[in-house]
């Protein structure tokens, strides 16, 4: 049943909005949708949630939401912001997620998320991002998802990452990334989850990847890569890769030799005419291995240490013979 | 604890080849860099070359291109320098380093003394 | 090959005081904003030891009376209160490109 409290709560509930108790005395307040031009101004300050996306906001005061100081969850997304100002989430001391894609930012509000210290998730992607600023982050000490998808990045904004040392997962998908270079994500010690797929990336630095010492899950798949990405060999817990949809000719000799853990590679969509005879050599998590018209292979691939492979799919090779081993190699 | 563990002082002549070993423990081996660096008697320091262990993946200083080759062994998470056609000039403390946070050499080991002496 | 160059090369600095060693490297040794110089500190017949990384981060451990500053071509190391057991050489070193090159060192000494 409901408390004394939660119908005072109610009570504070914007016109048009859809308002209910969150189970801790405070308050989730829904107005999506609802053709709104500016925020509410009769919000309760006992809100925890806060859903504002898909109206027609163009712009945030200073200062908009005061004294909500128990807010957890603001949502901007889907309006028509094309900048933010410094003290936009004054006050704001618990938020911790953060959602302003598919606005029409063009650069990283930086003044305005300066201080935002509980900040766990924040959301730009589908915005018009094409610089982010090297201090944008640096208040963000929380920060554990990050959104930046889908903007107009050319780079990796190298030095704005180095203050995230607590981020678990990042996409830069979708975006206009032309290399990566040499500690591009060297801070980033916790990073398990990196997206970097439909850029144009065509070349990796050989450093590229050091530093991402928890990465789990790597993501490349539809760049310009002509070379096989060599730098992912310090990835020491990757269990899931992708770069298919390349322009990868070779897998070269021990070509996962840093990647024990690895569970499954998608590697499909490459004009890969060669692989090493060690390429897939102890990957004992290994399940799937699609090798189709890699025409220079001639030797069957050398699966030691690969023992748990539960298909494997070769075709167009020009191989003549399997080795007498080859049953032991597998299950 | 990491830590990096290298082998003992070798004397050689001029003209021979050294091994250098560097035992490494308390990380994993295959995720950074080691880097090898030289230290003349009263000198500076002077960077060889550097490996990622269990690949192939090398880099000389073009200086001792020639007669340098750094390998690993991940059974034993050593890494090995040998130095050929040695000279008296390469009379050096040789160090082994891990290269950490973006490349720098963040633990050494002890140094292994070479003495090249007719 | 990047020539780094220290100054000075040696220094006498009474207990408490400030020392500050300069490096200059011949060429830029920023990349995407990123100063890719170190510094570390060696004592008599010891390894050296990381202090500095990226020009002014403070290697973990490394007391807080050591800092770094500078950016592309001209770094400094500054020890606010010189402590006796600072006494040490100080070498600079870069990464931004092979052949990886060290400073020829600045020796501290207590005046």
């Known amino acids: 049943g409901s408390s004394p409290r939660s119908g005072v709560l109610l009570r504070g509930c914007p016109t048009h909005c859809h308002c209910e108790p969150d189970g801790r005395m405070l308050l989730r307040v829904d107005c999506s949708d609802l053709g709104l031009s500016e925020l509410p101004s009769n919000l309760s300050v006992f809100t925890s949630y806060l859903d504002l996306s898909m109206n027609n906001i163009s712009q945030l005061l200073p200062n908009p939401l005061p004294s909500l100081r128990f807010l957890e969850e603001l949502r901007l997304a889907g309006n028509a912001l094309t900048y933010i100002p410094k003290g936009a989430f004054t006050g704001l001391y618990s938020l911790k997620v953060l959602m302003l894609q598919n606005n029409q930012l063009r650069h990283v509000p930086t003044e305005a998320l300066q201080n935002l210290r509980s900040l766990q998730s924040l959301r730009l992607d589908a915005n018009h991002i094409s610089y982010v600023p090297p201090s944008c982050f640096s208040g963000l000490h929380s920060l554990r998802h990050l959104w930046l998808d889908d903007n107009a990045l050319t780079e990796i904004p190298v030095q704005a990452f180095r203050s995230l040392s607590a981020l678990q997962a990042m996409t830069l998908a979708l975006n206009k990334i032309h290399h990566i270079p040499d500690y591009a994500f060297g801070n980033l010690s916790s990073l398990v989850v990196l997206h970097l797929h439909n850029n144009r990336i065509h070349s990796l630095g050989k450093k590229c990847f050091d530093g991402l010492h928890s990465l789990e899950t790597l993501d490349l798949n539809y760049n310009n890569l002509d070379e096989f990405p060599t730098a992912i060999r310090t990835l020491s817990n990757l269990k899931e890769l992708g770069f298919h949809s390349n322009n990868i000719r070779s897998i070269p000799e021990k070509a996962f030799v840093g990647n024990p853990s690895l569970i499954t590679i998608h590697f499909y969509d490459n004009p890969i005419q060669f692989v090493g005879r060690s390429a897939f050599q102890h990957l004992p998590e290994l399940r799937t291995l699609t090798l189709n018209g890699a025409s220079q292979i001639t030797e069957f691939p050398d699966l030691t240490g690969t023992a748990n492979l539960e298909s494997l799919t070769l075709t167009g090779a020009q191989i003549s013979s399997l080795p007498q081993t080859v049953c032991n190699q597998l299950p | 604890e990491v830590q990096l563990v290298q082998s003992g002082a070798e004397v050689k002549k001029p003209g021979a080849s050294v091994k250098v070993s560097c035992k490494a423990s308390?990380?994993?081996?295959?995720?950074?860099?080691i880097e090898w660096v030289r230290q003349a008697p009263g000198q500076g320091l002077e960077w060889i070359g550097e490996i990622l262990p269990g690949s192939d993946s090398t880099d000389y200083n073009e200086k001792f291109k020639v007669r340098v080759t750094i390998t690993s062994d991940t059974s034993t998470s050593t890494v090995y320098l040998e130095l050929s056609s040695l000279r008296s000039e390469d009379t050096a403390v040789y160090y082994c380093?891990?290269?950490?946070?973006?490349?720098?050499?963040?633990?050494w080991g002890q140094g292994t003394l070479v003495t090249v002496s007719s | 090959d990047i020539v780094m160059t220290q100054s000075p090369d040696s220094l006498a600095v009474s207990l408490g005081e400030r020392a500050t060693i300069n490096c200059r490297a011949s060429?830029?040794?920023?990349?995407?904003?990123?100063?890719?110089m170190h510094w570390y500190q060696q004592k008599p017949g010891q390894p050296p030891k990381l202090l500095i990384y990226?020009?002014?981060n403070l290697e973990s451990g490394v007391p807080d009376r050591f800092s770094g500053s500078g950016s592309r071509t001209d770094f400094t190391l500054t020890i606010s209160s010189l402590q006796a057991e600072d006494v040490a050489v100080y070498y600079c070193?870069?990464?931004?490109?092979?052949?990886?090159?060290f400073g020829q060192g600045t020796k501290v000494e207590i005046k």
């Open positions: 060429e830029s040794v920023d990349n995407y904003g990123n100063s890719f």
């Open positions: 308390g990380y994993t081996f295959s995720a950074y860099w």
């Open positions: 380093a891990r290269g950490g946070h973006y490349g720098s050499l963040d633990y």
């Open positions: 070193q870069q990464n931004y490109e092979d052949p990886f090159t």
């Open positions: 990226l020009a002014s």
